[in-house]
């Protein structure tokens, strides 16, 4: 019935951890991927979308090779961080035209916040450096109009599917070398 | 300077139809969702309709339900509300507003829709 | 009956600060932003405050919005005479699929 009381947990095995991770992290980029198709169906918008709020996609996968855990984990989670409050924000403040886009979006805003809690748990069970609370983040702007709030949600959906892509192929590479 | 204006209005019979107009200006109207609210005399306000900005996502009140038709045309700055079967709790002053999210940030001045026998 | 609760009046004196309180559900305070509207005698509404807490420019610092789970107030400081109007909150509701509004509180400026 358990370890005694007072001995060490068995810490799980950081690989299989990691495995579990890139799991979540792979469907939440298939469910982006989903709705990205959806929005650009429904509201399509030509040429490439940006919102000043948004995190810089945080490396180019060829420069994947140079990276450590550590910092490949810190950074992922503040990014999608930014994401979670984003997709917030869309869900709040965009109008009845993106409610066309419900339940998907407020499914994605679960799994994104689940996996954040999974970076948290595999940070700690890493033994990696807790980071200070982030200091809160101004609010983000109101859209001008439906058509900027259209646009802000390419942005927001295409930004997160690629740092999820990145997100990805750098974990499965990190895991080669635990 | 933003402005929308409303017509159509007036005294009409239980059971007849009528169809509002709000001719905007001063904006890009083909960016921005469209409301209908209206406000029966000495009442509150009632969201009616919403139509989003390229009109093809229509939302609508329970009481207006399969008897009112919210609709565009981007190409002459128009907002439509089109209204059949009415009746007498229909009678109101019907207000269009421009929306950039959830919030009237413009309204027009209103044209009053009165169902009598 | 409305789907946010506001109570059907609210009075000060000039210079007092008063409140009104908008009550709603998880379905639309607690989940969508809250506006705010003021309806002058006469007049079509005029937004006041969105976004549960930002005034669009041209209005003045002494109304405030704020919000607290399924509720919200709007709070006017140094009440004035032109403040004497009805006040209206409303949200989007994800259960009805469409705007809500309160029943409105109208205010009276006395003396």
């Known amino acids: 019935p358990g370890p005694p009381p007072g001995s060490p947990r068995a810490s799980p095995d950081p690989r299989a951890e990691l495995d579990s991770t890139v799991l979540l992290t792979r469907s939440l980029l298939e469910d982006t991927r989903q709705l990205t198709i959806q929005l650009k169906d429904k509201f399509p918008a030509d040429g490439d979308h940006n919102l000043d709020s948004l995190p810089t996609l945080a490396m180019s996968a060829g420069a994947l090779g140079a990276l450590q855990l550590p910092s490949v984990l810190t950074r992922l989670r503040a990014d999608l961080l930014s994401y979670l409050r984003h997709v917030q924000w869309l869900r709040r403040a965009m109008g009845s035209s993106l409610k066309t886009l419900e339940p998907e979006l407020g499914t994605l805003q679960t799994r994104l916040d689940r996996l954040l809690r999974r970076l948290q748990l595999l940070m700690s069970r890493l033994a990696l450096p807790q980071l200070p609370p982030d200091p809160p983040a101004p609010p983000l702007a109101p859209p001008s109009s439906t058509w900027g709030g259209i646009r802000a949600a390419h942005a927001i959906l295409g930004g997160l599917h690629l740092t999820l892509d990145w997100a990805v192929r750098g974990l499965l590479l990190l895991k080669t070398r635990l | 300077q933003v402005q929308l204006v409303e017509s159509g209005g007036g005294v009409v019979q239980p059971g007849r139809s009528l169809r509002l107009s709000c001719a905007a200006s001063?904006?890009?109207?083909?960016?921005?969702?469209m409301h209908w609210v209206r406000q029966a005399p000495g009442k509150g306000l009632e969201w009616v309709a919403v139509i989003s900005y390229e009109g093809s996502n229509k939302f609508y009140a329970d009481s207006v339900k399969g008897r009112f038709t919210i609709s565009r045309d981007n190409s002459k700055n128009t907002l439509y509300l089109q209204m059949n079967s009415l009746r007498a709790e229909d009678t109101a002053v019907y207000y269009c507003a421009r929306t950039p999210g959830f919030h009237f940030d413009y309204w027009g001045q209103g044209t009053l829709v009165t169902v009598s026998s | 009956q409305s789907v946010l609760t506001q109570p059907p009046s609210a009075s000060g004196t000039p210079g007092q600060r008063v409140t009104i309180s908008c009550s709603g559900s998880s379905s639309n305070i607690g989940s969508n932003y809250v506006n705010w509207y003021q309806q002058l005698p006469g007049t079509a509404p005029k937004l006041l405050i969105y976004y549960d807490d930002l005034r669009p420019s041209g209005v003045p610092d002494r109304f405030s919005g704020s919000k607290s789970g399924t509720s919200a107030s709007l709070a006017i400081s140094g009440l004035r005479s032109e403040d004497e109007a009805d006040y209206y909150c409303?949200?989007?509701?994800?259960?009805?699929?469409?705007?809500?509004f309160g029943g409105g509180t109208k205010l009276t400026v006395l003396g």
């Open positions: 409303s949200a989007w509701d994800d259960s009805l699929s469409g705007v809500v």
């Open positions: 001063g904006f890009t109207f083909s960016h921005y969702d």
